[in-house]
């Protein structure tokens, strides 16, 4: 007569996280009397998953009714599988005996692998803004996936990037894995509306990759160009001087007018014009009362953009071109007036 055999027909099974795993086990005989127990792992450190004789195992249900006479099916179903449940499960027949059960026979084991979806990729850029022509690094991270095989791609505005390095951790076996990738991106002046995309493809995603994005508007700083011009005379003894601040990003900008090196007025950019590429323009102007000046005036438009060192542009205003008339400016008040058009 053949003695009892423990049959685990599945060498391995793969289950998606959150689902239930069914581990099959049948025995070929009702003898010897004694319980079936399920373990994860082998050896002295093995973890008890289910004991037919006693104990409370809230996540485990038996596939068959073990109270049914002649039952030889000891398959179990484990609910709400997580990556931590991965491992090799053994169905073990014990022989009833005092003082402790004697292990009688073990099945060959069933390896449970857990398919866990990667978390949504998180893309982060540099801490400080950078200007066009500079190379900046973006990182992409995704966690908690299994199995280890995963594909990560970088795109800028739909164009695939090639300058990146990717690591999947840990290197050895684990219940779940993480991916970390760093891509290098060269900024251009047109990148305010650009996006950097990290795309992760994994077997659990059924061909629908996950994407994480970063807007380059959070990273780029486009410094302004300045142009100071003198407008035609508005009225006798008055000259209109404008400072055109063009193609800057982000909006944060402070402008100071200096008259012969002395601060005349400071204003913060408010009503801006947006360009198609996402940059901004702004214009500030001054009405200069030339009759208040005996000598030529050096007007300087000084701009501090996004906390960076100030840039400036100057304009020499020739007073001699406008002969001074005594008493023409008897009204009290400043020699310079300014306004910024709405």
């Amino acid at each position: 007569e053949e003695e009892l055999q423990v049959i685990q027909p599945d060498k391995s099974i793969s289950v998606a996280a959150g689902e239930s795993a069914t581990l099959h086990c049948t025995v070929t005989s009702l003898i010897p009397v004694g319980p079936i127990q399920w373990f994860r792992g082998a050896g002295p450190g093995r973890e008890l998953i289910y004991n037919q004789k006693e104990g409370h195992f809230p996540r485990v249900t038996t596939v068959s009714d073990l109270t049914k006479r002649n039952n030889m099916d000891f398959s179990i179903r484990i609910s709400n599988i997580t990556p931590a449940d991965a491992g090799t499960y053994y169905c073990v027949k014990f022989r009833k005996g005092s003082p402790d059960h004697v292990e009688f026979k073990s099945g060959a084991g069933t390896e449970l692998s857990v398919r866990a979806k990667p978390s949504a990729p998180v893309v982060s850029g540099p801490a400080a803004r950078a200007t066009p022509q500079h190379t900046v690094s973006f990182t992409c991270e995704s966690h908690g996936f299994s199995p280890r095989d995963i594909t990560l791609k970088w795109f800028k505005n739909g164009n695939e990037l090639s300058d990146f390095q990717t690591n999947v951790d840990p290197a050895g076996d684990s219940v779940s894995y993480s991916i970390h990738s760093t891509a290098k991106v060269v900024l251009t002046r047109e990148d305010v509306h650009s996006q950097v995309i990290c795309e992760v493809a994994h077997v659990t995603l059924q061909g629908d990759p996950l994407r994480g994005t970063a807007n380059l508007s959070e990273t780029i700083r486009v410094p302004p160009t300045l142009e100071v011009t003198q407008q035609p005379v508005r009225a006798e003894n008055q000259v209109n001087v404008t400072c055109q601040v063009r193609k800057f990003y982000p909006q944060r900008l402070q402008l100071t007018w200096l008259e012969n090196g002395n601060v005349s007025r400071t204003e913060t950019a408010s009503t801006l014009t947006e360009n198609k590429d996402g940059t901004y323009n702004w214009m500030s102007w001054l009405l200069v009362n030339v009759s208040a000046h005996r000598d030529d005036v050096k007007l300087t438009c000084q701009v501090e953009h996004d906390g960076q060192p100030a840039v400036s542009k100057s304009h020499d205003l020739k007073v001699s071109a406008h002969p001074k008339e005594q008493g023409s400016n008897t009204a009290p008040g400043p020699a310079l007036a300014s306004a910024a058009p709405l």
């Epitope: 003898i31 009397v33 004789k53």
Partner: antibody, heavy 115, light 111 residues
Framework: RQLVESGGGLVQPGGSLRLSCAAS????????ISWVRQAPGKGLEYIGT?????ITYYASWAKGRFTGSKTSSTAYLQMTSLRAEDTAVYYC????????????WGQGTLVTVSS | DIVMTQSPSSLSASVGDRVTITCQAS????????LAWYQQKPGQAPKLLIY???TLATGVPSRFSGSGSGTDFTLTISSLQPEDFATYYC???????????FGQGTKVEIK
Amino acid sequence: RQLVESGGGLVQPGGSLRLSCAASGFSLSSHGISWVRQAPGKGLEYIGTIGTGVITYYASWAKGRFTGSKTSSTAYLQMTSLRAEDTAVYYCARGSAWNDPFDYWGQGTLVTVSS
Amino acid sequence: DIVMTQSPSSLSASVGDRVTITCQASQSVYGNNDLAWYQQKPGQAPKLLIYLASTLATGVPSRFSGSGSGTDFTLTISSLQPEDFATYYCLGGGDDEADNTFGQGTKVEIK
């Protein structure tokens, strides 16, 4: 499905007897066969269970004098050094207790130990 | 060895009565549920009624029920029928595979 015992009868004290238990309608290969006896006018008494190979065990009082064996169709109980107090109806039953209870029983065979 | 004590040893009851028989083990039975109940009529082999303390055997009428765990067990016949007059035995199993002991029996007689 049934079990049919045979081999009972009159035996002298100190003598031996071999009881048979034939199964029909099912195979004994995946089941234990247990032996239970009942002295006249008394209650039931468990003797032992015959499984496969080394899986054979007996109540403490029966060790040494009672040995069992089985094939896929028949189980046997060998009894030696019989005494008057062994006089009883001997039953075979399919099962080995706990989750494998004694569900099919033979009709019993009477063993009388007397000089 | 485990010792099983049944009570009462006999009882008289009428058809339709609710009958309760108890069985006490000298130690916890194996798995707290290694307890079966058998019915035996004169000149017949025993018949399995209940196993694993409360599982009804195939073909047994639902008026029979078993309960209990550890050391104390009960067989209940909810409404005694004429064919239920017989002797009832509990069989308890200890931790050792050979440690199986019957109670002394409870004879249910017609009042």
